[in-house]
């Protein structure tokens, strides 16, 4: 039994890091493998993660962690029984994938303005809380070409757009994702999408 693709890990910079790797053949990850991880500090102990299958030869492990700080560094040991298959390290602050925003809501009752709001996925005491920016994706269910991205570079988790920038009388969907420039993170996953029917009053033509 050998590791084909070494573990790569990302942290949500809160409580979970996710490590994925591939074995050289079909593997029952949860029964055959264990990933041990240990914070490199005095009096820290190793914790065990039981991996799950992620495709035939793929494994994934969700590591429970303390609130992350930039100094944190973990040793990682991948074991198959008594055999050490791989040894490495992981610094969560250098491999951050933020949590996805939640509670995306489209408010359509504001005089021909669409107000999209969502929730910041972090509590106020987390460092990322005040460092997230967002991308909002809006698309038409009827027209695949009607697909747009709005970059929200301010901290407030909301976006206002004129309803007239979208077609009237058809259904749209929206979703939002986050990233943090300070840690050069990857983008989060997209939030669940929300749907609304876009309708607005056409302005009277002036003659």
């Amino acid at each position: 039994m050998k590791v084909l693709q070494e573990p790569t890990c990302v942290s949500d910079y809160m409580s979970i890091s996710t490590c994925e790797w591939k074995m050289n053949g079909p593997t029952n990850c949860s029964t055959e493998l264990r990933l041990l991880y240990q914070l490199v500090f005095l009096l820290s102990e190793a914790h065990t993660c039981i991996p799950e299958n992620n495709g035939g030869a793929g494994c994934v492990c969700h590591l429970l962690m303390d609130d992350v700080v930039s100094a944190d560094n973990y040793t990682l040991d991948l074991w198959a029984g008594q055999q050490l298959l791989w040894k490495g390290s992981f610094k969560p602050s250098e491999h951050v994938k933020p949590r996805a925003p939640g509670n995306l809501t489209v408010h359509t009752n504001v005089s021909d303005t669409l107000l999209l709001t969502w929730s910041n996925p972090y509590p106020p005491d987390n460092y990322l809380y005040n460092h997230l920016t967002y991308a909002v994706n809006i698309w038409s269910e009827n027209d695949p070409a009607d697909f747009r991205i709005y970059n929200v570079t301010y901290l407030e988790p909301s976006l206002r757009i004129a309803a007239s920038t979208l077609k009237s009388g058809i259904s749209y969907r929206a979703r939002v994702r986050a990233w943090a420039q300070c840690y050069n993170t990857t983008w989060s996953e997209w939030s669940p999408s929300t749907k609304w029917h876009n309708s607005y009053r056409e302005p009277f033509e002036q003659h």
Partner: antibody
Framework: EVQLVESGGGLVQPGGSLRLSCAAS????????MSWVRQAPGKGLEWVSA????????YYADSFKGRFTISRDNSKNTLYLQLNSLRAEDTAVYYC??????????WGQGTLVTVSS | DIVMTQSPLSLPVTPGEPASISCKSS???????????LDWYLQKPGQSPQLLIY???NRASGVPDRFSGSGSGTDFTLKISRVEAEDVGIYYC?????????FGGGTKVEIK
């Protein structure tokens, strides 16, 4: 919210014994090393002992080895310190603390141990 | 054991003025990853100690930004940019490089 509540302190005669407890809540107790620190009246802080999250590793300052014993019951979220062969100079407030990144991130309110005849 | 030495023993301060406390260790607290294994704690009158600064220079959650830690190796400093009345108490440094964990003797900060 992390909470640590010590108990078990009191008046004991020289040569006597006492068991201190520290009830923990607000965090996954078994994942953290824990420690005892004491403070004699009007004096500074003195580290006594620590124990790993699983209870398998214990550490003591030299002056307490053989007399004090640290232990934990993860099923009860409780840390203990057994004090034996107590002397007058062991009179102090004993604090339990949660260890993280080598440091003492959260402290209890302390329990007073008085050794006197 | 690593010996921690703090100075001054007592520090009378004026509210609004800066204050500085020194801590020296008998051996270097700088480890391989580039972090200094030194914490600062404050014990307010009648209270338990609380963590202020960890790893030499990182403020613990909820600690006001008027507190800062600096230094490396064997020489460390805790600075309060503008002292407030609520900052009175005894300040301790502690090394977290090895067991036994050892504290400095403490610096008592009081209002003039």
């Amino acid at each position: 919210e992390v909470q640590l509540v010590e108990s078990g302190g009191g008046l004991v005669q020289p040569g006597g014994s006492l068991r201190l407890s520290c009830a923990a809540s607000g965090f996954t107790f078994s994942r953290y090393a824990m420690s005892w620190v004491r403070q004699a009246p009007g004096k500074g802080l003195e580290w006594v002992s620590a124990i790993g999250g699983s209870g398998g590793s214990t550490y003591y300052a030299d002056s307490f080895k053989g007399r004090f014993t640290i232990s934990r019951d993860n099923s009860k979220n409780t840390l203990y310190l057994q004090l034996n062969s107590l002397r007058a100079e062991d009179t102090a407030v004993y604090y339990c603390a949660r260890l993280l990144r080598g440091g003492l991130w959260d402290w209890g309110q302390g329990t007073l141990v008085t050794v006197s005849s | 054991d690593i010996v921690m030495t703090q100075s001054p023993l007592s520090l009378p301060v004026t509210p609004g003025e800066p204050a500085s406390i020194s801590c020296k260790s008998s051996q270097s607290l700088l480890e391989g990853q580039g972090y200094n294994r030194l914490d600062w704690y404050l014990q307010k009158p009648g209270q338990s100690p609380q963590l202020l600064i960890y790893l030499g220079s990182n403020r613990a959650s909820g600690v006001p930004d008027r507190f800062s830690g600096s230094g490396s190796g064997t020489d460390f400093t805790l600075k309060i940019s503008r002292v407030e009345a609520e900052d009175v108490g005894i300040y301790y440094c502690m090394q977290t490089l090895q067991t036994p964990l050892t504290f400095g003797g403490g610096t008592k900060v009081e209002i003039k």
